[in-house]
Interface confidence: low
């Protein structure tokens, strides 16, 4: 691109009188300094539009010469008002002013869009002294312009607490369109309308937008930026992008994929984390979500026993974590388990079914028909019971636990006995005479200790007093007499 300098106002000669505009004179600069200014005043001017016939802020000096003639007003000379150039090109512009020598310590600062330019900018101030006045030229150069260099530049000079401001110099950096908003990837419902937005800026303006779907242009005529494309609906995945055109050329946005939401894939890798007598902890790996977030999952459980009625238990849970504890299961039972998850479109198919088993549990029923009597001749207490119903043991019986508590005149002590699974009777030694013995029995499996039977009490008299009457708990629904040995 060609660097173009365009003047919006006819410039005055750079220097009146002894300072020709070319600077190619015998006056060599007395001093040449890079710009460095310590003060940073607030913005104190309103930029004027190029072409306005004045010379910025003017300071009227109050000092008079020996002949008492007032000094001319101080003002920056007019210079180029508007520079248009392409990105990465170099540019140099300046402002100049003639200052009577009676003024000392004059400094010129550069400002852009109301902010002082400090530090690493290429600003040079040159001083050309003469008998009565010093010509000051402040130059500003940018070696490779960026879009961020766009703006209004002015010079400021401080003299005797007066501030003199130059006319603005407008720098316009032109380049390829620059995207401020690009289309974004979306997941959409099949055959449902959606919008895509594309916005790009110059300069130069205008910027025109073409939409592209799967490498083909969507619109025959370009639309001015910003552009919103309304897609009436898709039945399959598509890739969209937009082209932004201006006088400098074309920029293409990133291509974005528009996915069609679908039901999820079934979960995979359903696995058993832990089993107890009445619960199974499972985990699973979700399948592909169908471009729509998972909401819920359903765990389906059916008894694997061929004789079962085939009914399915369903447990619903949230999608996260991918973990669920299935409860209220029977002990020592086999189950088939499958998992399905849903998104806003619908439910996935069920995962491959896996087989899982619950472990033995503690018995759920106490031994029945507990009978206790005193065998005084051997100073023993005999205990008898009936095995609890096998189906309710929740596992293989490994034995019984007997609790016997002896209470007499403020003394109370509990003893525990273990009995093998084949027994249905036990004999314990009398611990205390003239006392009450309370007996309870519980069945034991590998899964734990079941509930204790209701307590049965028997009084153990002092030596010499005989009572052969047994104490017992009746077996439910069983009126048969209990054999007493």
């Amino acid at each position: 691109a060609i660097t173009e300098a365009r003047e919006e106002a006819k410039p005055y000669p750079l220097f009146p009188g002894p300072f020709p505009g070319s600077l190619q004179t015998d006056h060599t600069p007395l001093l040449s300094l890079p710009h460095a200014s310590g003060y940073q005043p607030a913005l104190m001017f309103s930029p004027t539009q190029p072409g306005r016939p004045h010379t910025g802020n003017v300071a009227i000096p109050q000092v008079t010469s020996v002949e008492s003639k007032p000094l001319p007003p101080l003002a920056f000379k007019h210079t180029v008002g508007h520079i248009i150039l392409s990105e990465h090109k170099g540019v140099k512009f300046n402002c100049s002013i003639s200052v009577p020598n009676i003024y000392q310590d004059t400094t010129i600062s550069w400002w852009k869009d109301g902010k002082e330019l400090l530090g690493a900018h290429h600003a040079i101030t040159q001083f050309y002294p003469d008998d009565e006045v010093t010509a000051i030229i402040a130059s500003f150069s940018i070696t490779s312009v960026q879009r961020s260099d766009n703006g209004s530049y002015i010079c400021k000079m401080k003299i005797n607490n007066e501030e003199i401001v130059s006319d603005p110099i407008y720098i316009e950096v032109q380049g390829l369109p620059h995207f401020t908003k690009q289309p974004e990837s979306m997941n959409v419902t099949r055959n449902t309308a959606f919008n895509l937005t594309c916005q790009a800026v110059g300069p130069p303006e205008p910027v025109n937008i073409f939409w592209v779907q799967n490498s083909s242009r969507v619109n025959e005529q370009p639309e001015k930026s910003p552009s919103v494309l309304t897609v009436p609906g898709l039945t399959e995945m598509a890739v969209f992008s937009c082209e932004a055109h201006n006088d400098k050329g074309l920029t293409v946005s990133k291509g974005v994929q528009i996915n069609i939401k679908a039901i999820p894939s079934p979960p995979t890798e359903v696995s058993i984390r832990n089993s107890t007598a009445h619960s199974i902890l499972i985990s699973w790996v979700p399948g592909f979500d169908g471009y729509s977030p998972f909401r819920n999952c359903s765990i389906q459980v059916k008894e694997a026993d061929p004789l079962s009625n085939g009914s399915v238990m369903i447990f619903n849970t949230s999608a996260l974590p991918h973990l669920y504890q299935i409860k209220q299961l029977q002990a020592l039972a086999n189950y088939s388990i499958g998992v399905s998850c849903m998104n806003e479109i619908g439910w996935s198919a069920v995962s491959p079914w896996i087989l899982a088993s619950t472990t033995e549990g503690a018995p759920s029923v106490a031994p029945l028909n507990v009978t206790v009597f005193l065998n005084e001749s051997s100073d023993n207490v005999d205990i008898r019971w009936m095995k609890p119903p096998t189906k309710q043991q929740d596992g293989e019986l490994v034995g019984y636990r007997i609790s016997h508590v002896w209470q007499s005149a403020g003394i109370s002590k509990e003893l525990l006995e273990e009995v093998g699974q084949n027994g249905s009777r036990a004999r314990i030694s009398v611990q205390v005479h003239n006392a009450t013995c309370t007996v309870r029995i519980a069945a034991v499996t590998r899964g734990g200790v079941g509930p204790f039977s209701d307590p049965v009490k028997i009084f153990i008299p002092a030596h010499g007093w005989v009572d052969y009457a047994p104490s017992s708990t009746p077996a439910p629904g069983n009126a048969d007499p209990v054999l007493i040995i």
Epitope: E184, M186, N187, V285, D289, S318, L320
Partner: antibody, heavy 120, light 108 residues
Framework: QVQLVQSGAEVKKPGASVKVSCKAS????????INWVRQAPGQGLEWMGW????????KYNEKFKGRVTMTTDTSTSTAYMELRSLRSDDTAVYYC?????????????WGQGTTVTVSS | EIVLTQSPDFQSVTPKEKVTITCSAS???????FHWYQQKPDQSPKLLIY???NLASGVPSRFSGSGSGTDYTLTINSLEAEDAATYYC?????????FGQGTKLEIK
């Protein structure tokens, strides 16, 4: 572009409640969860829970259950988090975040944070 | 609750060095559920790496992630001054979602 803009700082007394807002823009609000994550001064990040704007489905960290309520207003694409019975250890910066599902839950966009100070 | 433990808690490094931050989980996590964040002072956290090794948008290629099972690593090759921040790991495997305690990286 996706943006989450949160309400300003709050100073509350112990026992009071605070309600923080989070306005979403640049994406379809109802498609993603809004999560709330807090960070006590000089501490790490702590997840409080999420809400799915499409149907109001919430999931809370057990630690905050009973004290926190998350809601949304889909007409304004705004999420709210209310924390009740405030204690001094609730002093923190509260962030709203967009939860990216992909079944793998991470937070791809964050709000600028709202400082809540609980002091008597 | 899955507990994530980062190591070290603090590290002071010179520019151009290679930095490794590790994160150990209390139970096995699929690599798909493991993510890293960067938080610079007085800023919100920013997604850095998702699914163990995928760089989030705009993240420089000097960052990388790896790991499986219970042990995950964030690596910064040729550290730059702008990398001074606190780094957090996060798991998306189970609720409650949890973060590591953070690793503060200081540039010497």
């Amino acid at each position: 572009q996706v943006q989450l803009v949160q309400s300003g700082a709050e100073v509350k007394k112990p026992g009071a409640s605070v309600k923080v807002s989070c306005k979403a823009s640049g994406y379809t609000f109802t498609t993603y969860d809004i999560n709330w994550v807090r960070q006590a001064p000089g501490q790490g990040l702590e997840w409080m829970g999420w809400i799915y704007p499409r149907d109001g489905y919430t999931k809370y960290n057990e630690k905050f259950k009973g004290r926190v309520t998350m809601t949304t207003d889909t007409s304004t694409s705004t999420a709210y988090m209310e924390l009740r019975s405030l204690r001094s250890d609730d002093t923190a910066v509260y962030y709203c975040t967009r939860g990216y599902y992909d079944n793998l839950y991470y937070f791809d966009y964050w709000g600028q944070g709202t400082t809540v100070t609980v002091s008597s | 609750e899955i507990v994530l433990t980062q190591s070290p808690d603090f590290q002071s490094v010179t520019p151009k060095e290679k930095v490794t931050i590790t994160c150990s989980a209390s139970s096995i996590i699929s690599s798909n559920y493991f993510h890293w964040y960067q938080q610079k002072p007085d800023q919100s956290p920013k997604l850095l790496i998702y699914r163990t090794s995928n760089l989030a948008s705009g993240v420089p290629s000097r960052f990388s992630g790896s790991g499986s099972g219970t042990d995950y690593t964030l690596t910064i090759n040729s550290l730059e001054a702008e990398d001074a921040a606190t780094y957090y790991c996060q798991q998306g495997r189970s609720v409650p979602l949890t973060f590591g305690q953070g690793t503060k990286l200081e540039i010497k």
